[in-house]
Every structure is written in structure tokens, then in C-alpha cells.
């Protein structure tokens, strides 16, 4: 958790921002709060990001101020004009680009005082695994796809009846680069499954945790896929 | 279409101080952060300043910072580099660049004005 | 301050060629990374930037890829108007740095 201190001759109020995630191509959210103050025109929301020349977005007066604006967020970012009010600061931010990621400071004025938290923000692709049994190929075999990573994850097979097995003999992982020239699709092949079983195909890369699984049996298929964002902690 | 056109440069003694002006064009200026950049006598390509597209932030490189002050007239779509306590290894061709609407860096490039610094 | 090491200084290519020049920063970039040219006789001019985008009315034989620390340019089937000076220039942080420079001239 950051809390951010004010600046002498003024009181400090409380920031807190929270480090996320945001997949390329959609849309983000950089969370900040503050103590809220009574009157939202004396509130100064200023968004700024290490290494940028000039603001990352800038809201006073109950109204964005955008002349100051870095050339690469233009017509990009938002806050929630409604929440301000009530200690929302929090940036959605469009689009979002590999060169987003960065330190961001969220820095706020209000008639109570001042402060600021940084936040860490990652970027990059991440996508939902689905698993399915390939009745093309000669043997029982699974295929693991997923349409978009980056960086290139590592995929990892696991059973549920052969628990702890390594699976990298018995496995093929490809990555193919997508048309935008960035972000990959990711196919794994798992070869000489049983019956009766439950696997799961596991992407990770350094922003998010993804799993596919599938349970085969002699009656039907059921599949499960679940992702998880890494390293979200509050500041 | 836009254009930008650098003038000032001139031959100066070292400790001098030299104003170079380019004139922009073709665009709203205002809406654009501009930079200058130097080209040594060897080549090697040096950012010098940058200011955002209101005016309120410039940045420097350590080589010029406290010699060097970029600055930026909305009124006659001019941006400015005032040099002072000039080196000699301030030599270089200078060039007024524009960036990007997508947030790209020396997108545009003016053809750019010849400082000396020279006993 | 981020050090851009660019190679080759200088290459020798024909029509027709493809050709790729690299760029390593001393840390990781974040495809923050642009890259310009300098015809001769002309001034220089943005080709790439965030990486991978084409500036405005740059030929789509020029391509730029790369991530983490290193990066590249490609142009494929070189045409006489290519054969030019190449910079590349991080931008993920202040000071804004440049490569050395590729000159690229006619074998």
C-alpha cells in the first residue's frame, strides 16, 4: 500500500493506487482513491507517467483540462467524473499499448491538502485457454489455444490422476506471431491421453496466469478455463 | 503539409550566447510537444530539449541543463532555443522536430540551422 | 542514461535486397523505439515508431520489430530511394537517446 504524504505549508491527504494489468488492444483501468473532498471544484486530479513530456491526463474544476496532454494518450484516457467526488481518481485509459507500461503518478489536490502514489503498470496479452480433443491426429490427442500472449509464455500440461507427471516429452507448444507483428497465438499439443482423466493446459508470463482444463470421459467433455492478473498489489 | 524552418545559427565564440528560432507550419501547434536535436560534426544524432505542447514542461539532457532554455510563442507558431555559455562541443547542425499525433518522437524534422562554436 | 548500441555502422546491399539493421538498449525499452531517415541531401524524417507503426506514408516495405532490449528494422526488396542513413531513438525515458547510425549504400 502507498500512501502519499502532502507537500509543507499544506496538509497531506491519503492517495492509494493499486499496481494492474492492461491487455493490449482494450481497455485499462489505473486505480487511484483519495479522501474525498465536499466540493469537486476544488479537486485537482493530475496523472503523470515517468519519462512522459507533459501530463498523462489532468482533471480540475469539475472538468478534464487536456492542453497539457502527452500526444500519446490523446483521446485515450477518462476519469469517472461522477466518482470524483466521492475520492475516485481512477484512469481509464483506451486502446492500451505495449509502451503504456510504466510508472504512473497519481497526484491530487484538493481544499483539504495534497498527495501522490505511484503505480506500477504492465502491459501486455493475455487470453483465455480453450482445450480440445483433436480427433484429427492418429492417436488421442488434446489441443490447447489460445489467440493472443505476449511476452511469450511457457505452457505447462498437468493430469489430475497423473499428478506430478512431466508432460514436455509427450508435448509440442508453437507460438505464431498475429498480424499486428506483437502479441502470439499459442497452440499446444498434448499426445497419448486417457480416457477418464482430467488435464490442464497452463500459460503463464510475467502478467498473467491462464489454465484451460479438460475432463474426458466415455460419455462426455467437460472444459473449464479460468485467468488470473499477477502482481496486482495495492500501493 | 507541415513544415518547419530553423534560423540563428551563426559562428560564435566559446562563452557566447546564440537565439535559434524555427518557424512551424502546416499545423496546429499548439497541439504538438516539439524537441531539439543536434547532429554533431561526427555524425552522432543528440536530443537537446523537448517542451510539451502547452509550454508548462521542457526537459534537458544534462549537457545543456542550465546553459539551454526552450521556449515556444503559440501567438506566431514560432519555437525558440536560447544557448548560453556556448561550448565548443556545442558544434553541430540543430534541428526543430515535431512528434507525432499517435505520441511518436521526431516524426518531422526541419532542414535544420549550422551553430560554430570557435575561437 | 540509456545507451542505444545500432549495427551494422554501415552495410553494402542491392536492389532488391532485404536488408535488417539492430538496435540494443542497455536496458529494456518497452517498445518504446522509433526509427528515422536521412536521405542524402534531404533532412531526416520518423519511419517507425512505438516499435512496429509505420508513420504516415511510409512504404509497407519497411517493417520494425522487436521487444525487451532489442530491436530491428527490416526493408524488404530495397528500392534507390532506401539506400539512406538509419537512426534508431528510444523514448522511455528523459534523455531521449539515438543509435549511432547505419549508412546503407549501394554494392
Known amino acids: 500500500l502507498i500512501i502519499g504524504f502532502g507537500i509543507s505549508g499544506r496538509h497531506s491527504i491519503t492517495v492509494t493506487t493499486v499496481a494492474s494489468a492492461g491487455n493490449i488492444g482494450e481497455d485499462g483501468i489505473l486505480s487511484c482513491t483519495f479522501e474525498p473532498d465536499i466540493k469537486l471544484s476544488d479537486i485537482v486530479i493530475q496523472w503523470l507517467k515517468e519519462g512522459v513530456l507533459g501530463l498523462v491526463h489532468e482533471f480540475k474544476e469539475g472538468k478534464d483540462e487536456l492542453s497539457e496532454q502527452d500526444e500519446m494518450f490523446r483521446g485515450r484516457t477518462a476519469v469517472f467524473a461522477d466518482q470524483v467526488i466521492v475520492g475516485n481518481a481512477s484512469l481509464r485509459l483506451k486502446n492500451v499499448q505495449l509502451t503504456d507500461a510504466g510508472t504512473y503518478k497519481c497526484y491530487i489536490i484538493t481544499s483539504k491538502g495534497k498527495g501522490n502514489a505511484n503505480l506500477e503498470y504492465k502491459t501486455g496479452a493475455f487470453s483465455m485457454p480453450e482445450v480440445n480433443v483433436d480427433y484429427n491426429a492418429s492417436s488421442e490427442t488434446l489441443r490447447c489455444e489460445a489467440p493472443r500472449w505476449f511476452p511469450q509464455p511457457t505452457v505447462v500440461w498437468a493430469s489430475q490422476v497423473d499428478q506430478g507427471a512431466n508432460f514436455s516429452e509427450v508435448s509440442n507448444t508453437s507460438f505464431e506471431l498475429n498480424s499486428e507483428n506483437v502479441t502470439m497465438k499459442v497452440v499446444s499439443v498434448l499426445y497419448n491421453v486417457t480416457i477418464n482423466n482430467t488435464y490442464s493446459c497452463m500459460i503463464e508470463n510475467d502478467i498473467a496466469k491462464a489454465t484451460g482444463d479438460i475432463k474426458v470421459t466415455e460419455s462426455e467433455i467437460k472444459r473449464r478455463s479460468h485467468l488470473q492478473l499477477l502482481n496486482s498489489k495495492a500501493s | 503539409e507541415v513544415q518547419l524552418v530553423e534560423s540563428g545559427g551563426d559562428l560564435v565564440k566559446p562563452g557566447g550566447s546564440l537565439k535559434l528560432s524555427c518557424a512551424a507550419s502546416g499545423f496546429t501547434f499548439s497541439s504538438y510537444g516539439m524537441s531539439w536535436v543536434r547532429q554533431t560534426p561526427d555524425k552522432r544524432l543528440e536530443w537537446v530539449a523537448a517542451i510539451s505542447t502547452g509550454g508548462s514542461y521542457t526537459y534537458y539532457p544534462d549537457s545543456v541543463k542550465g546553459r539551454f532554455t526552450i521556449s515556444r510563442d503559440t501567438a506566431t507558431n514560432t519555437l525558440y532555443l536560447q544557448m548560453s555559455t556556448l561550448k565548443s562541443e556545442d558544434t553541430a547542425m540543430y534541428y526543430c522536430?515535431?512528434?507525432?499525433?499517435?505520441?511518436?518522437?521526431?516524426?518531422?524534422w526541419g532542414q535544420g540551422t549550422l551553430v560554430t562554436v570557435s575561437a | 542514461d540509456i545507451l542505444m548500441t545500432q549495427s551494422p555502422s554501415s552495410m553494402s546491399v542491392s536492389l532488391g535486397d532485404t536488408v535488417s539493421i539492430t538496435c540494443h538498449a542497455s536496458q529494456g525499452i518497452n517498445n518504446n523505439i522509433g526509427w528515422l531517415q536521412r536521405k542524402p541531401g534531404k533532412s531526416f524524417k520518423g519511419l517507425i515508431y512505438h516499435g512496429t507503426n509505420l508513420e504516415d506514408g511510409v512504404p509497407s516495405r519497411f517493417s520494425g520489430s522487436g521487444s525487451g532490449a532489442d530491436y530491428s528494422l527490416t526493408i524488404s526488396s530495397l528500392e534507390s530511394e532506401d539506400f539512406a542513413d538509419y537512426y534508431c531513438?528510444?523514448?522511455?525515458?528523459?534523455?531521449?537517446?539515438f543509435g549511432g547510425g547505419t549508412k546503407l549504400e549501394i554494392k
Open positions: 531513438v528510444q523514448y522511455v525515458q528523459f534523455p531521449r537517446t
Open positions: 522536430t515535431r512528434r507525432g499525433a499517435t505520441g511518436s518522437w521526431f516524426a518531422y
